[in-house]
């Protein structure tokens, strides 16, 4: 066969679907690889062909579109399963071609089993809610295109194993789940099950997401440097190890990049000749406020090092702060014999 532009296996699109549920999978060519859509391709005389490789097999084979009740079908650039079976797992390829043009991409599809509480190997999206921030909503995800607007589905919401009913601050409202005032206790996995009829059959779509309650922007502050501070002096003798921690608290801010760095005499440690190492550790509170600690370490400090300026800097979307460490050379205690000699007026 003639050459085909092969985009390979698109592992970025690791598609996971639940067993025994409908799945609609768009050919990724038009979404991520080509500069034209399916309609343009179709009107230009290009044909979309689907085939697949079963799990643990190397053989590419055509997809059987003649199964009972049209279990697998294709509509425009969408491959439909009504519903999926466990052994549909494999790598699927969509190929766009005519006599002069060919382009194809493969993607993995994993059909996943769930237990009675909706637990499964499915990778769950995380939805962050601000703590005590007023009404916030989550929406049952990825259900568009499964049924026409004339069909009125029923939606049941669960938290973990349990139907959401008579919760103080969580109210199911069709496709939405409203949190009147989000609290830490609202952390957890939420599942919506959408039930709809089609051609005399009932189908279900199960969607689970993780809700994480995070710090509110109302309470967000610029970074706070807890250490170094004015109360601690790093007093060392030459030859000792100098350890200075820089500990910074960052309020949770959505999509904020939190940064901590040291400067020595106004330069980054990488840009100076001192043998300095920096180790970083990060911890999070329950609301994802972050504490970053960078420990600056000089194994054998010199008297020159003890005269330098050591400044800890921190930056977030809320602002930038800096704090200098108080470093000084320890004055050695006077030797006893010298003191005595001086006391007796020796020259």
């Amino acid at each position: 066969s003639e050459r085909c532009d092969d985009w390979g296996l698109d592992t970025m699109r690791q598609i996971q679907v639940f067993e025994d549920e409908p799945a609609r999978i768009k050919c990724p060519l038009f979404e991520h690889f080509l500069k034209f859509n399916y309609s343009t391709a179709h009107s230009a005389g290009l044909t979309l062909i689907w085939y697949w490789t079963r799990q643990d097999r190397d053989l590419e084979e055509p997809i059987n579109f003649r199964l009972p009740e049209n279990r697998i079908s294709k509509e425009k650039d969408v491959l439909w399963f009504r519903p999926t079976l466990l052994n549909d797992t494999g790598n699927y390829t969509c190929m766009l071609r005519n006599t002069t043009y060919c382009s194809k991409v493969a993607f993995p599809l994993e059909v996943v089993q769930k237990d009675s509480c909706f637990n499964s190997p499915m990778k769950l999206p995380v939805h962050k809610l601000y703590i005590e921030y007023g009404i916030q909503r989550i929406t049952c995800p990825n259900v568009d295109g499964y049924f026409p607007s004339s069909v009125k589905p029923t939606i049941t919401w669960y938290m973990g194993c349990y139907k959401i009913q008579n919760f103080n601050n969580v109210i199911p409202e069709g496709m939405n789940l409203s949190f009147l005032i989000a609290l830490i206790s609202n952390n957890g996995n939420y599942t919506c099950v959408v039930t709809y009829p089609e051609n005399g059959r009932t189908f279900h779509l199960t969607r689970t997401l993780t809700v994480k309650v995070v710090g509110s922007p109302k309470n967000a502050v610029p970074p706070v440097i807890h250490s170094p501070n004015d109360h601690v002096v790093y007093e060392k003798e030459p030859g000792e190890e100098l350890l200075i921690p820089c500990t910074v608290y960052f309020s949770f801010l959505m999509d904020s990049r939190n940064e901590v760095w040291w400067t020595i005499d106004g330069k980054k440690p990488d840009d100076i000749t001192i043998d300095v190492t920096i180790n970083e550790s990060i911890s999070h509170s329950r609301t994802e406020d972050e504490t970053r600690t960078q420990i600056l370490s000089i194994k054998k400090v010199t008297s020159e090092d003890l005269k330098r300026s050591y400044v800890c800097h921190a930056r977030s979307a809320k602002g930038e702060v800096a704090k200098a460490a108080k470093v000084k050379q320890k004055v050695p205690a006077p030797r006893y014999t010298v003191e005595l000699a001086c006391g007796f007026g020796a020259t």
Partner: antibody, heavy 117, light 107 residues
Framework: QVQLVQSGAEVKKPGSSVKVSCKAS????????MNWVRQAPGKGLEWMGR????????HYAQKFQGRVTITADKSTSTAYMELSSLRSEDTAVYYC??????????WGQGTLVTVSS | DIQMTQSPSSLSASVGDRVTITCQAS??????LNWYQQKPGKAPKLLIH???GLHAGVPSRFSGSGSGTDYTLTISSLEPEDVATYYC?????????FGGGTKVEIK
């Protein structure tokens, strides 16, 4: 299409046990709940319990707790309901009912169990 | 357990009549209510789930409504094949419980 085929009628002595089977086809057996409901002659419906064959999770009505056992064989897509210490008031038609969630979407044809000395 | 009280226990109506059956729960059930139809000598069939969701293949003359503790099944225009006993069932809290049934006959 979904089909639930139950075992045949049984006549049992008081104090004995009965085990009714329900063979499922036309859907993924491990992905739905299988309920058991009974109906005494001329009476209404009474829910006994259910199982999720995927992980074996069971729930029973308090009334039947300790006397009923619901099991499932994934290899044959068959659910079972065993009721022990039978008494005359257990005479009823026993139904299995499949539900992806809690509603029982599809039902078996029923199995008449008669308890008589 | 939640008690489900259905009324009337039986009714007789003419073909084409609008028929209404009510179901009252002993406590709020948050719309977690199903309606089943059982014809003589047959297994029940699901008609309506979650108060108003028509099950696949069920004729549109059947509809459900209600909230809190009070729920209704309506047959907009009675057909001869609708002769059956109708049961409501709550699935808010285990154990699931059924109403006593409403027997519908043709005059």
């Amino acid at each position: 299409q979904v089909q639930l085929v139950q075992s045949g009628a049984e006549v049992k002595k008081p104090g004995s046990s009965v085990k009714v089977s329900c063979k499922a086809s036309g859907y993924t057996f491990t992905s739905s709940w299988m309920n058991w409901v009974r109906q005494a002659p001329g009476k209404g419906l009474e829910w006994m319990g259910r199982i999720y064959p995927g992980d074996g999770q069971t729930h029973y009505a308090q009334k039947f707790q300790g006397r009923v056992t619901i099991t499932a064989d994934k290899s044959t897509s068959t659910a079972y309901m065993e009721l022990s210490s039978l008494r005359s008031e257990d005479t009823a038609v026993y139904y299995c009912g499949e539900g992806y969630l809690d509603p029982m979407d599809y039902w078996g044809q029923g199995t008449l169990v008669t308890v008589s000395s | 357990d939640i008690q489900m009280t259905q009324s009337p226990s039986s009714l007789s109506a003419s073909v084409g009549d609008r028929v209404t059956i009510t179901c009252q729960a002993s406590q709020g059930i948050n719309n977690y209510l199903n309606w089943y139809q059982q014809k003589p000598g047959k297994a029940p069939k699901l008609l309506i789930h979650y108060t108003s969701g028509l099950h696949a293949g069920v004729p549109s003359r059947f509809s459900g409504s209600g909230s809190g503790t009070d729920y209704t099944l309506t047959i907009s225009s009675l057909e001869p094949e609708d002769v059956a006993t109708y049961y409501c069932q709550q699935y808010s809290i285990l154990p699931w419980t059924f109403g006593g049934g409403t027997k519908v006959e043709i005059k």
